[in-house]
């Protein structure tokens, strides 16, 4: 015999108190799959948590974090405080990146500057706490007579033919 509850679609529940007919989920609850015997309570986004998506009869609410915090964990179960760019969050709070490292975001850890010489390149722009170094051409490309960049042809004055 087929379970009569299997006919109940998402957004409803199989109501045992009413001969297993499909009843709509009550307010502030949802069922995301069919055949459910109960509806789940909607998540409430309170405090540091802001509503990103409202709860509907078929899907839970989704939260994100208020400015100054960012989501951690599955489904944004926690909000971790931001640091400034050029910092990382340690056991003792937000700390500046050590020399030779950078963080261009408000979260995450400080990462080492790119070592341009590993790719045979030179440093074009020095790194900072907030920005990685910018690597330029290899030192060999910068030696006299070895320019890889073709200079533009000199402009000819009107009325002069080429030599």
């Amino acid at each position: 015999l087929q379970d009569p509850c299997s006919n109940c679609p998402a957004g409803t529940f199989c109501d045992n108190n009413r001969n297993q007919i499909c009843s709509p989920c009550p307010p502030n609850s949802f069922s995301s799959a069919g055949g459910q015997r109960t509806c789940d309570i909607c998540r409430q986004c309170k405090g540091v948590f802001r509503t990103r998506k409202e709860c509907s009869s078929t899907s839970n609410a989704e939260c994100d974090c208020t400015p100054g915090f960012h989501c951690l964990g599955a489904g944004c179960s926690m909000c971790e405080q931001d640091c400034k760019q050029g910092q990382e969050l340690t056991k003792k709070g937000c700390k500046d990146c050590c020399f030779g490292t950078f963080n261009d975001q408000k979260r995450g850890i400080c990462r080492p500057w790119t070592n341009c010489s590993l790719d045979g390149k030179s440093v074009l722009v020095n790194g900072t706490k907030e920005r990685d170094v910018v690597c330029g051409p290899s030192p060999a490309d910068l030696s006299p007579g070895a320019s890889s960049v073709t200079p533009p042809a000199p402009a000819r004055e009107p009325g002069h033919s080429p030599q």
Epitope: G47, V48, S77, M78, C79, E80, Q81, L89, K91
Partner: nanobody, 124 residues
């Protein structure tokens, strides 16, 4: 070991004020967000307020906004809840709770340590 001990509850008339304290020990208090949660007689737990580790960010349940103020003194390892304009519906056991990760605010389900609670009764 982590300990949270609330105090300051009592009987107060409607419109009155109380200040709850929560003394913390056994962890680096200044690194953790803290919360107040309450349980009215015969009801479930209700989140009241959060404060981040440094004390500069505070959050409140709608029903207490403008009446309650959460604060902390990291030098004294103490959390506070100043409750003004108290109403009968504020009657509850008030618990302080610690969040599980440093510099992070969690949902109530994830708080890892709770105090034993202090009873606040608002009645004539």
């Amino acid at each position: 070991q982590v300990q949270l001990v609330e105090s300051g509850g009592g009987l107060v008339q409607p419109g009155g004020s109380l200040r709850l304290s929560c003394s913390a020990s056994g962890f680096t208090f200044s690194s953790y967000a803290m919360s107040w949660v309450r349980q009215a007689p015969g009801k479930g737990l209700e989140w009241v307020s959060d404060i981040n580790s440094g004390g500069e960010s505070t959050f409140y349940e709608d029903s207490v906004k403008g009446r309650f103020t959460i604060s902390r003194d990291n030098a004294k390892n103490t959390l506070y809840l100043q409750m003004n304009s108290l109403r009968a519906e504020d009657t509850a056991v008030y618990y302080c709770a610690k969040h599980p990760l440093t510099y992070t605010i969690a949902t109530m389900n994830d708080y890892d340590y709770w105090g034993q609670g202090t009873l606040v009764t608002v009645s004539l």
